[in-house]
């Protein structure tokens, strides 16, 4: 008779989670010489230790501290790109603009990107059937707490001009409930960060509106200004052309507005 297992509302742990984390760790440390010293087995042990045998609705940032310590990484603090609801374009951008970094370009972000994981209280098993959903079950679940922890640290490390890519196709271009809106915005350090520059990415080819005037962008500006950080905003009307011009800035068509 199978043992009773808690049924959560979200999808279960990603298939082959342990192997995936280790494979990614090996690949990352090979590609990034500055992280060659990292022991991937220890990273996995620390990752596992953060959630195994713990109730998946009772995870704390403290649980992830051993992993955070092992994954400590210095990225140029003035080359940070945050994003909200537009991950793919942000990642395409940093793949071309190699001196800029999203959270997923760091070891810990790279390890966990697009993965789901959770355990069960008092057993060493990983739950591949279901994991807590942030809305329907609980917010202090392993995945949410992980991203909250690494996002906070990433924002805290930022300095000078910080860029954020926002999705202009969404009803809330800036969403206070997103990780960017609820964590990163509030953890930028005013004594280090001079300006937050938002890039609003347009979806429609014929969309010529100035989305920097959107009420949610004004709300973001207000939050940032109250934190004594300057705010600027740019419309990216043609994301395809924008990426092309990052690749080939000397192209004659790249002098006009993108």
């Amino acid at each position: 008779v199978p043992r009773w297992r808690q049924q959560w509302s979200g999808p279960g742990t990603t298939k082959r989670f342990p192997e995936t984390v280790l494979a990614r760790c090996v690949k990352y440390t090979e590609i990034h010489p500055e992280m060659r010293h990292v022991d991937c087995q220890s990273v996995w042990d620390a990752f596992k230790g953060a959630f195994i045998s713990k109730h998946p609705c009772n995870i704390t940032e403290e649980d992830y501290q051993p992993l955070m310590k092992l994954g400590t990484q210095t990225v140029p603090c003035n080359k940070i790109l945050l994003w909200s609801r537009i991950k793919d374009l942000a990642h395409q951008f940093t793949q071309v603009q190699r001196d800029m970094f999203t959270l997923e370009d760091t070891l810990l972000g790279y390890l966990a990107d697009d993965l789901t994981w959770c355990g069960e209280f008092n057993t060493s098993k990983i739950n591949y059937q279901s994991c807590p959903d942030w809305r329907k079950d609980c917010s202090n679940n392993p995945v949410s707490v992980f991203w909250k922890t690494v996002s906070r640290r990433f924002a805290e490390a930022a300095c000078d001009v910080v860029h954020v890519m926002l999705n202009g196709s969404r009803s809330k271009i800036f969403d206070k409930n997103s990780t960017f809106g609820s964590v990163e915005v509030h953890n930028l350090q005013p004594e280090k960060v001079q300006t937050l520059e938002a890039w609003v990415i347009h979806g429609g080819r014929e969309d010529s509106r100035d989305l920097c005037q959107d009420p949610t962008i004004k709300e973001l500006e207000s939050i940032i200004s109250k934190r004594n950080i300057q705010f600027s905003c740019k419309n990216i009307y043609r994301p395809d052309k924008f990426l092309q011009c990052v690749k080939n800035p000397e192209d004659s068509s790249c002098t006009s507005e993108i």
């Epitope: 298939k15 082959r16 989670f17 342990p18 192997e19 995936t20 280790l22 494979a23 990614r24 090996v26 690949k27 440390t29 022991d39 991937c40 087995q41 996995w44 990983i126 591949y128």
Partner: antibody
């Protein structure tokens, strides 16, 4: 305790196909991926292919590309390795193995003999 | 692809002697992902060492592994007649997983 139990020996004619099964117990195929390794008489161990969690797909050693298909049935926790267009040099013991990055566990092996 | 080269191809020693088998990689291998196997005719490969130096469950203490980077070795401190077999090193840090060509250990 992790166990991998493979199907029995097969004798095939050149040009035929063979499908070897590997039933796992003590864990599920959701947790770890299966790799296949063969050893021909008097030869060394040769990795044939296996699941790459980095890319989320099965990858094959160049030598076996297009001639081997590795599949799995997670409902029965059984992995399969099918090889087509068999030649006499495919005579070997075929092993399923699991536990990449951890402790490797091996099936008992399946002898496939290709002979006319 | 990481190529593993084992030496010697054949090693012939007497019981009680010390055997040292070498495995050299074409590029650096993360130690945690280097293993050693013992293979006897008709039997599945037996994992002896993983992580370059950790003995697998049930493996006698006379077997030990060492090395890092591109140079690894397996040592059998005092040979027993039952150690007659072919020994393979394996790396699994990168796909394709690769094996050395093997060292045949003969007991005189």
């Amino acid at each position: 305790q992790v166990q991998l139990v493979q199907s029995g020996a097969e004798v095939k004619k050149p040009g035929a196909s063979v499908k070897v099964s590997c039933k796992v117990s003590g864990y599920t195929l959701t947790e770890f991926s299966i790799h296949w390794v063969r050893q021909a008489p008097g030869q060394g161990l040769e990795w044939m292919g296996g699941f790459d969690p980095e890319d989320g797909e099965t990858i094959y050693a160049q030598k076996f590309q297009g001639r081997v298909i590795m599949t799995e049935d997670t409902s029965t926790d059984t992995a399969y390795m099918e090889m087509n267009s068999l030649r006499s040099e495919d005579t070997a013991i075929y092993y399923c193995t699991t536990g990449r990055f951890f402790d490797w566990f091996w099936g008992q092996g399946t002898l496939v003999t290709v002979s006319s | 692809e990481i190529i593993l080269t084992q030496s010697p191809a054949i090693l012939s020693l007497s019981p009680g002697e010390r055997a040292t088998l070498s495995c050299r990689a074409s590029q650096s291998v993360i130690s945690r992902f280097l293993s050693w196997y013992q293979v006897k005719p008709g039997l599945a490969p037996r994992l002896l060492i993983y992580g370059a130096s950790t003995r697998a469950t049930g493996i006698p203490v006379r077997f030990s592994g060492s090395g890092s980077g591109t140079d690894f070795s397996l040592t059998i401190s005092s040979l027993q007649p039952e150690d007659c077999a072919v020994y393979y090193c394996q790396q699994d840090s990168n796909l394709p997983i690769t094996f050395g060509q093997g060292t045949r250990l003969e007991i005189k």
